[in-house]
Interface confidence: low
């Protein structure tokens, strides 16, 4: 549902988007993800901040926690214990890195309507969670793990060696958080809460990145983070499991690492509980083309965990790295030994496979020249997954159900025809046993969230349809969007083009390329967005294009792994190729073409500007990587190998932005970076600037003091205002 366009006389009453609209978030949308607590019940925070329990089958709802109670401790989040006796309330949120934060936690007793007094939790806590059954608590404080059998009980300390920036228990260090686990936690309860598994990360030997945080004091603070850059010493990881019923009996037991993994540097990549006494661990060699999935069983007699070689499953890539961005995780079936997993099929497309005994004997469940993206849920009779199969648009996501409990095991697209024009990009959230599920549609029309019956797929109700947004957009001249493809030298380049509202093919328009282009990313997606580039098209009359070139995801391994060991080559080439094709279309002003990107996109935009093609008049790089030697080991080595002479040092050196400093002479370049960027360090832009100065090349720059990789808050407004001025000047558009 894109608001319908009004023509002729009514068009006068419509207005273009303004930069202020974007910066104020005037046209932001809402989604509704139920917080499922059973097969037919979910919690949701109402508009007035009450925590409400909804029962789908009875249609009843009641407040389990009032906004008054939430406000009494300034709570910004909550968590109900599975036995429904207690709620934790989270306040004093303090962000650390992408996922991690610390907070203060209060436990509220629902049975007597009071906060639990005595044996209160320490503060600030790094991570806290309920057991999956009952109301045991596990939490991490000062890098150590603690256990409470009941909220009011004294804690049992599980680990003692935790030390800031040295030993992390139950939480990841920087690189595992950002590049491997993508979570703030590294502990996992077994399904019935009998065991607690956790990771210990030893960062003692990791080199430290240090940068100044200026703050308001007379002297800046120095932030120190153990951060392994490419080729540096990595964290040492160990996995332990403790019996939470008798935690002091034998204490934490270490889970053995598969021999073929332990023989050289390795990573732990994920842990999946199968039953209370069976656990599945995934490991990865430092050279990330071999992954091992190891299924381990509890040995009652020895109180240890046994991981037989017969339960080791190897996944190896001969054409690139293992997996997509991450190695996929298994979804176990009810027999507690076989599982479903997404990996490349013989044709080089990521598909769902069913593994019963060995990976070699895996049964391929989905197939075709498209990709399965995510397995949401496996029940006794159905498997729900998402893919981009429908109508052959890689940038769409639909939800499918395959019946696995009976024959024929038919496949049904649950979402393909629901709201076909409005909704082409879905995710889903399932209740226990998939009795019900919520569909969240992200576009291309205005997002909508709906509730469905898990057996019939029937829509039960609309959870959020963004009516206010729809009304607000009625008098806005939104740009037109097209998603199409270019066929170039046996490569398909999908692109999204954002066109001014009164676009006329016979006229010439300035072109802005927005690029990300990182391995296993996707920019051309059928999603709704009213953002900065929408404004540039709507108000400033620019054409904006996003292109998914080689290295991008969900179109098969040939495209994905094309960039393996040679980052910074094909991604740039494909952006340039696309620009040439856009010029051929006849409506682009060849003298007014720009490119911009953030992070990996800043790297690609910098290299494109320095390509010497003469195509680009100007460009912007926000927080770019400038040399792969400066970036994190886990990410960089996955795609580039090691920066050693006998591996890939030569391409590490050849692919820097600094090596092309001379080529910036004939373009207008704006370089932007936050000084407190923990992810892509300010070092990257400092080195670009140094190289440009040494080459006596003029450029523009902006730094954001004490800002990280996201450039948030007031910096965001300043950033987009500044970039707008730069582009308008470049394109000779009046302010």
């Amino acid at each position: 549902l894109r608001p319908s366009r009004v023509h002729n006389s009514e068009e006068n009453t419509m207005r273009a988007l303004t930069l202020k609209d974007i910066l104020n978030g005037t046209f932001s949308y809402k989604t509704f993800f139920p917080n499922w607590i059973s097969g037919q019940e979910y919690l949701h925070q109402s508009a007035d901040n009450n925590i409400v329990l909804y029962n789908i089958e009875t249609g009843q709802s009641y407040t389990i926690l009032s906004n008054r109670t939430m406000k009494s401790v300034n709570a910004s989040n909550y968590g109900l214990s599975p036995d429904r006796q207690f709620v934790y309330l989270e306040s004093d949120y303090s962000k650390l890195w992408r996922y991690s934060y610390t907070a203060t936690y209060y436990i509220y007793d629902l049975s007597n309507g009071e906060f639990v007094r005595g044996n209160e939790l320490p503060r600030p806590i790094q991570y806290l969670c309920w057991s999956p059954v009952g109301s045991k608590l596990a939490y991490v404080y000062q890098n150590n793990i603690y256990l409470k059998q009941r909220p009011g009980d004294p804690p049992f300390q599980i680990t003692f060696n935790g030390r800031e920036n040295k030993i992390f228990n139950g939480i990841p260090d920087w690189v595992y958080e950002e590049e491997m686990l993508a979570t703030k936690y590294a502990l996992w309860w077994s399904p019935n809460g009998k065991f607690l598994a956790y990771a210990e990360f030893n960062d003692t030997d990791i080199p430290v990145i240090a940068y100044s945080y200026y703050g308001d004091e007379q002297y800046p603070r120095t932030i120190n983070i153990p951060y392994p850059k490419a080729g540096a010493k990595n964290p040492v990881v160990r996995i332990f499991i403790i019996d939470t019923t008798y935690p002091a009996y034998v204490g934490p037991q270490e889970v053995p690492v598969p021999a073929m993994i332990a023989s050289s540097d390795y990573y732990f990549s994920w842990l999946t509980w199968v039953t209370d006494e069976r656990v599945c661990l995934q490991w990865l060699k430092r050279v990330q083309n071999v992954s091992v999935l190891s299924i381990c069983d509890f040995r009652e007699d020895w109180q240890t965990w046994d991981c037989p070689k017969t339960q080791e499953h190897i996944e190896e890539s001969r054409t690139g790295w293992a997996g997509g961005f991450f190695v996929s995780t298994p979804v176990f079936s009810y027999d507690a030994i076989s599982y479903y997993k997404i990996f490349s099929d013989k044709d080089g497309y990521k598909h769902i496979h069913y593994i019963k005994d060995t990976v070699e004997n895996a049964i391929q469940i989905t197939s075709g020249k498209w990709e399965a993206i995510n397995i949401f849920r496996v029940t006794q009779d159905s498997l729900f997954y998402s893919s981009n199969e429908f109508e052959e648009y890689p940038g769409r996501r639909n939800i499918y159900r395959i019946s696995i409990g009976s024959y024929p095991p038919s496949k049904k697209c649950v979402t393909c025809h629901l709201r076909k024009e409005r909704c082409q990009y879905y995710t889903a959230s399932f209740s226990d046993y998939a009795k019900y599920y919520a569909l969240v549609c992200y576009g291309p029309g205005i997002p909508i969230s709906t509730l469905h019956d898990g057996r019939t797929d029937q829509e039960i109700k609309i959870l959020e349809e963004n009516k206010e947004l729809e009304n607000a957009l009625k008098n806005i001249q939104l740009p037109k969007e097209e998603i199409k493809k270019l066929e170039v030298d046996e490569i398909t380049l999908w692109y999204k083009m954002i066109l001014p509202p009164q676009f006329d093919r016979s006229k010439k328009y300035p072109l802005l390329i927005q690029v990300y282009g990182g391995p296993c990313s996707q920019s051309v997606r059928s999603v709704f967005a009213v953002n900065w580039i929408s404004y540039l098209a709507s108000k400033e009359g620019m054409v904006i294009a996003l292109v998914d070139g080689r290295g991008t995801a969900f179109q098969g391994d040939k495209l994905l792994y094309a960039v393996y060991r040679k980052l910074g080559v094909y991604e740039v080439e494909d952006q340039i190729t696309a620009v040439r094709k856009f010029i051929e279309m006849g409506f682009i002003d060849e003298k007014r073409i720009a490119i911009w990107g953030w992070s990996y996109g800043g790297y690609v935009s910098s290299l494109a500007l320095a390509s010497g093609t003469g195509l680009f008049k100007c460009g912007i790089a926000v927080a770019p990587v400038s040399s792969w030697e400066y970036y994190a080991s886990v990410y960089t080595e996955r795609f580039m190998g090691l920066p050693t002479k006998d591996d890939n040092l030569e391409h590490y050196k050849n692919s820097t932005v600094m090596a092309r400093a001379e080529y910036f002479r004939n373009v207008d370049y704006l370089l932007i970076h936050g000084t407190a960027d923990d992810n892509v360090h300010f070092q990257n832009s400092a080195q670009i600037a140094k190289a440009l100065v040494n080459a006596q090349v003029d450029f523009q720059a902006m730094w954001y003091s004490d800002q990280n990789h996201g450039l948030s808050g007031l910096s965001t407004n300043h950033l987009y205002t500044h970039m707008t001025h730069f582009l308008k000047q470049c394109f000779s558009l009046s302010d």
Epitope: E360, Q364, K412
Partner: antibody, heavy 118, light 107 residues
Amino acid sequence: DVQLVESGGGLVKPGGSLRLSCTVSGFTFSSYTMSWVRQAPGKGLEWVSTISSGGSYTYYADSVKGRFTISRDNAKNSLYLQMNSLRAEDTAVYYCTRDQVGYAMDYWGQGTLVTVSS
Amino acid sequence: DIQMTQSPSSLSASVGDRVTITCKASQDVGIAVAWYQQKPGKAPKLLIYWASTRHTGVPSRFSGSGSGTDFTFTISSLQPEDIATYYCQQYSRYPYTFGQGTKLEIK
């Protein structure tokens, strides 16, 4: 009830062309991969070609590659096999089959006879 | 291509007999094997898929087993209506291939 009905068979000279059709009913055609399988007189079964549910992905046996084209029209619940440059060894009963995702062929049509002879 | 070698090519048995047909794949096909029954002048019918799973409505006297390269199809007690030609097929990868068939006759 699932039904697959082939048509379009007949006598054709070597080098000639023929277009087979398969009309289906009783299931959601657009959700299924479909195939053609043939059987020469008195011989065994030979897989010919497969097309994905959306119609974008096609697979062919080496013996027909470049000569046969499989296609489908989901709006019409129809599967097609365009056969060009026909040879005597293409003489067979051609069956249209419904495939499951990565599984066996669970429903077959009654077949249509193609005879290539001068 | 994967070859499916089926044996015997024909066999004669009496009503009530246990009948076994084997199929050998030239390379590992996991359990992606199906068995079909074809009566004279009729289209083939799916009996077994995933090497051992009976298709809907198929009598329990029909069974299949095996994985990797060696597969077996069994009729536990032959009935007169079972007179037909039986084919194995691998659907592990394209091109899909069939065995050459086993013609079953009543003694």
